[in-house]
Interface confidence: low
């Protein structure tokens, strides 16, 4: 039978919530990332913006979690089609907004 | 602790068939794509074949393609590798490797290798 | 079919650097893997997405990726370090391994 394609998504659903929860300090030194449009390819595009992030453990595992849902090599300073144009949030925002998002495509089933 | 067992290998005649078979503990063993490769006798790695972690899909080498068919039970935790019409280069030691968390199997590296288990083919 | 090419055999004096190449077109388009086999064992991942190393490979293993070629580092090489080496990289739905280095420690 198929392997439920939830298990990949619950477990980056919560490594993205214990990010939020143990948050004390900025998160990654307050770094900035790329903003996405998160309608589609969320996972090649997430993992572009936050590949540009470097030195910060907190994110080390969601990185190489989404590295798992995108199919091609990315590479820092990659350009995404799907990057919001000139719009750059905190690492924290982001974070926060993939979570959301994410958590709406479990909801609805939409795993990949 | 992650283990995988394989078992199944033997000594068959050209033509014959087998099935190894791989146990494996200490995982979510549904979450991960897993692989098979062998190694001939003082030869190098060959990927034979795999089986997604995120779907059904299955990747065949061309060298075993249309004569090998990997299949997984995630209620038993195992992996199978059924292989038929065999012959004397399919002789190596069969390795049944966890291939990472993720949709995309090929991009977590073969992070656990079983012990392996041989299969020799000859009459 | 797509090709690896590595050099059969490398040697390096204890404390020096072993350098292991791995060719194949536009490999650096793809992830590279880099594996370590002791004789009589199974293979060990050193090296994944060209440069990363897993937990509990020691910082003398790096790796690096671009244009045609994917390179192994040993540096401050040791006698443990002796060992069969392959590349790894993923094309159209299949995985394709280096032809292996051996890597002697003199």
């Known amino acids: 039978s198929p392997v439920p394609p939830s298990t990949a998504l619950k477990e980056l659903i919560e490594e993205l919530v214990n990010i939020t929860q143990n948050q004390k300090a900025p998160l990654c030194n307050g770094s900035m990332v790329w903003s996405i449009n998160l309608t589609a390819g969320v996972y090649c595009a997430a993992l572009e913006s936050l590949i540009n992030v470097s030195g910060c453990s907190a994110i080390e595992k969601t990185q190489r979690m989404l590295n798992g849902f995108c199919p091609h090599k990315v590479s820092a300073g990659q350009f995404s089609s799907l990057r919001v144009r000139d719009t750059k949030i905190e690492v924290a925002q982001f974070v926060k907004d993939l979570l959301v998002h994410l958590k709406k495509l479990f909801r609805e089933g939409q795993f990949n | 602790e992650v283990q995988l067992l394989e078992s199944g290998g033997g000594l068959v005649q050209p033509g014959g068939s087998l099935r190894l078979s791989c146990a494996a503990s200490?995982?979510?063993?549904?979450?991960?794509?897993m692989s098979w490769v062998r190694q001939a006798p003082g030869k190098g790695l060959e990927w034979v074949s795999a089986f997604s972690g995120w779907d059904v899909s299955t990747y065949y080498a061309d060298s075993v393609k249309g004569r090998f068919t990997i299949s997984r039970d995630n209620s038993k935790n195992t992996l199978y590798l059924q292989m038929n019409s065999l012959r004397a280069e399919d002789t190596a030691v069969y390795y049944c490797v966890q291939d990472g968390l993720g949709p995309y199997f090929y991009n977590y590296g073969m992070d656990v290798w079983g012990q392996g288990t041989t299969v020799t083919v000859s009459s | 079919s797509y090709e690896l090419t590595q050099p059969p055999s490398v040697s390096v004096s204890p404390g020096q650097t072993a350098s292991i190449t791995c060719s194949g077109d536009k490999l650096g388009d793809k992830y590279s893997f880099w594996f370590q086999q002791k004789p009589g064992q199974s293979p060990v991942l050193v090296i994944y997405?060209?440069?990363k190393r897993p937990s509990g490979i020691p910082e003398r293993f790096s790796g690096s990726n671009s244009g045609d070629t994917a390179t192994l580092t040993i540096s401050g090489t040791q006698a443990m370090d002796e060992a069969d080496y392959y590349c790894?990289?993923?094309?159209?739905?299949?995985?394709?391994f280096g032809t292996g280095t051996k890597v002697t420690v003199l």
């Open positions: 997405h060209d440069s």
């Open positions: 790894q990289a993923w094309d159209s739905s299949t995985y394709v």
């Open positions: 200490g995982f979510t063993f549904s979450s991960y794509a």
